[in-house]
């Protein structure tokens, strides 16, 4: 049998990805991160 | 608030043709993801599905009727029309249209049903 | 097509027992979607259906919460904690997952 009309079944959040780079000092190198709506995941 | 009715002949013939309107308010068919079915019941019997129609004119049908349904849209006068060819005394049933609407943010079932109205088909 | 299968057909119930209803599908009905399309309707007497249960257990707005849906796959159940005399009336299920949709027989809910 056809399946019957429906929408998917996720909706798509659209959000700004910013990866940024921060120098911590000359011993410790630098930091990468990622931060997803306003959040730092990375 | 949502309504539907339907409205047609309360008797029909044996081979004829019935025409049956669903005229509603409360919403629109111009709306995405709007849609607006039949169902028909036989006395004393279970429900049975026979056509859906949405807002982009994509139309669905229970194959047993195919043949014999059209289902279509006034989407300015807010009603659908419902046509069955060769009718039979078996299809003497209430016929109900019912919305139904598309979209995660909706409910995906049928929300609101008309008050039916019965067809008796008999020479 | 999915063939649903109610059962009982016929439920006597006391007013503040609990009631439950089956209905099997002869096919799974999960869509491609993920979502399964089991609802549930209740047709009281001279009146039209009216939608209790959606996507299997999410209540319809104003259906009171004595009123409960579960299940999965094909096994599909409608529990009502407490009956109450106006919840008389012909309860179906309905899958909207495969065309052509389909309702159970009904099951026929009755004060004892």
């Known amino acids: 049998d056809a399946e019957f009309r429906h929408d998917s079944g996720y909706e798509v959040h659209h959000q700004k990805l910013v990866f940024f780079a921060e120098d911590v000092g000359s011993n410790k190198g630098a930091i990468i991160g990622l931060m997803v709506g306003g959040v730092v995941i990375a | 608030q949502v309504t539907l009715k339907e409205s047609g002949p309360a008797l029909v013939k044996p081979t004829q043709t019935l025409t049956l309107t669903c005229t509603f308010s409360g919403f629109s068919l111009s709306t995405s993801g709007m849609g607006v079915g039949w169902i028909r019941q036989p006395p004393g019997k279970a429900l049975e599905w026979l056509a859906h129609i949405w807002w982009d004119d994509d139309k669905s049908y229970n194959p047993s009727l195919k043949s014999r349904l059209t289902i279509s849209k006034d989407t300015s006068k807010n009603q659908v029309v419902l046509t069955m060819t060769n009718m039979d005394p078996v299809d003497t049933a209430t016929y109900y249209c019912?919305?139904?609407?598309?979209?995660?943010?909706?409910?995906?079932?049928?929300?609101?049903w008309g008050q039916g109205t019965t067809v008796t088909v008999s020479s | 097509d999915v063939v649903m299968t109610q059962s009982p057909l016929s439920l006597p119930v006391t007013p503040g027992e609990p009631a439950s209803i089956s209905c099997r599908s002869s096919q799974s009905i999960l869509h491609s979607n993920g979502n399964t399309y089991l609802e549930w309707y209740l047709q009281k007497p001279g009146q039209s259906p009216q939608l209790l249960i959606y996507?299997?257990?999410n209540r319809f707005s104003g259906v009171p919460d004595r009123f409960s849906g579960s299940g999965s796959g094909t096994d599909f159940t409608l529990k009502i904690s407490r009956v109450e005399a106006e919840d008389v009336g012909v309860y179906y299920c309905f899958q909207a997952t495969r065309v052509p949709l389909t309702f159970g027989q009904g099951t026929k809910l009755e004060i004892k």
């Open positions: 019912a919305r139904r609407q598309l979209g995660l943010r909706s409910i995906d079932a049928m929300d609101y």
């Open positions: 996507k299997v257990s």
